[in-house]
Interface confidence: medium
């Protein structure tokens, strides 16, 4: 089959843009750390990089291969208000590199960490 | 309370970066359109803008207020392979503006669309 080169270029561009790589995402601080329901953060979210995008095959998953940690200062508010908003510094995982890994490898990796 | 102004600025900057706005995301084409399990797309994902980020309150949700449509050409593969990959042009919703809306309003909006 003969394909229009413009179509091939645009498809290639789509591959590029959707590849598995660190992407800027908004993380809900409370959900990330499973804090008490009476504790709130302002802002409620922080911006970090996490692996995301698509892999070429169903059996692959976009996973982080290296991680740094970012310290961010937020206001913590505990209800009922015993005091005003308190600045707290929290460390967030920031994915610095990613790879499409087989889901089986991911499963093994996670379970080996749990077993330690 | 006395606050370090550098902290106040960095907190404000976090609000800015996590605000509800159109964000570039990867959409799984098959999941987006609920296609048959024997149909695959290459690439499997496309890059579009969708509303994302955080709202200031639990009762608010980041929702699109305006949408454009982008046409993207992909290869469609049907198993068993009766023919080679076939170029198909598909239209994807691309969010162009967003707003934090009350979850109640979102619920009403969705249900009014369903009822029509």
């Amino acid at each position: 089959a003969h394909y229009n080169t413009e179509i091939l270029k645009s498809i290639d561009n789509e591959w590029r843009k959707t590849q598995c790589m660190p992407r800027e995402v908004c993380i809900d601080v409370g959900k990330e750390f499973g804090v008490a329901t009476n504790t709130f953060f302002k802002p409620p979210c922080v911006s970090v990089y996490r692996c995301g995008g698509c892999c070429n095959s169903e059996g692959l998953q976009c996973m982080n291969t290296s991680t740094s940690y970012l310290s961010k200062t937020l206001f913590e508010i505990t209800v009922p208000l015993s005091q005003g908003p308190k600045p707290v510094t929290i460390s967030f995982a920031n994915h610095t590199s990613c790879r499409c890994m087989s889901k089986l490898d991911v499963y093994r990796q996670v379970h080996s960490i749990i077993r330690r | 309370a006395h606050y370090n102004t550098e902290i106040l600025k960095s907190i404000d900057n976090e609000w800015r970066k996590t605000q509800c706005m159109p964000r570039e995301v990867c959409i799984d084409v098959g999941k987006e359109f609920g296609v048959a399990t024997n149909t695959f797309f290459k690439p499997p994902c496309v890059s579009v803008y969708r509303c994302g980020g955080c709202c200031n309150s639990e009762g608010l949700q980041c929702m699109n207020t305006s949408t454009s449509y982008l046409s993207k050409t992909l290869f469609e593969i049907t198993v068993p392979l009766s023919q080679g990959p076939k170029p198909v042009t598909i239209s994807f919703a691309n969010h162009t503006s967003c707003r934090c809306m009350s979850k109640l309003d979102v619920y009403r909006q969705v249900h009014s669309i369903i009822r029509r």
Epitope: - | T5, E6, D12
Partner: antibody, heavy 122, light 107 residues
Amino acid sequence: EVQLVESGGGLVQPGGSLRLSCAASGFTFTDNWIHWVRQAPGKGLEWVAVISPYSGATYYADSVKGRFTISADTSKNTAYLQMNSLRAEDTAVYYCARDADYKYAFWAFDYWGQGTLVTVSS
Amino acid sequence: DIQMTQSPSSLSASVGDRVTITCRASQDVSTAVAWYQQKPGKAPKLLIYSASFLYSGVPSRFSGSGSGTDFTLTISSLQPEDFATYYCQQSYTTPPTFGQGTKVEIK
């Protein structure tokens, strides 16, 4: 050209109220913090309050806390200072001032309005 | 609150003179100090921010230095338009506080 224009000053009796406005133009209003700074006749400068029009965060000097409220209307590019329970010591020229840039580490006021005089007297 | 103490409170100088104004903070404020110039009946103008950075459009004869608690504003060669009151301001913590001012007069 960046401009800040205050209005709403005047003579008010002790215990009275007044609302000052600061109309901003020539820059993206949500990109900068907006401060109110006052200067009593023949005296030095005193910071009053600040707002981030972007997030709505506000901070006040202890001398005005509970009596003054700073707010911003991003659709009008205007900041306000609602002053209640006014006292003689609140008499001053009130300036609104723009913070230099949200990316700078610390507050520094790069543009100021012309000021509006508030006189609290019976 | 952090106190900012300026000295001198006033000084007389001639055109061409080198003028130095100092400001002392009651506690460490890192480099979070700005300097302003104010003329009678006018709003203050920003000269220096973050202790030593010259604000855009400000003549290079103005310079700032210092960190921690001691800060200096220097005018290398005083010009006729420089006769005014100068204020230092810390913004390390809320509330930002100003010095009491230094009035530079013609000798």
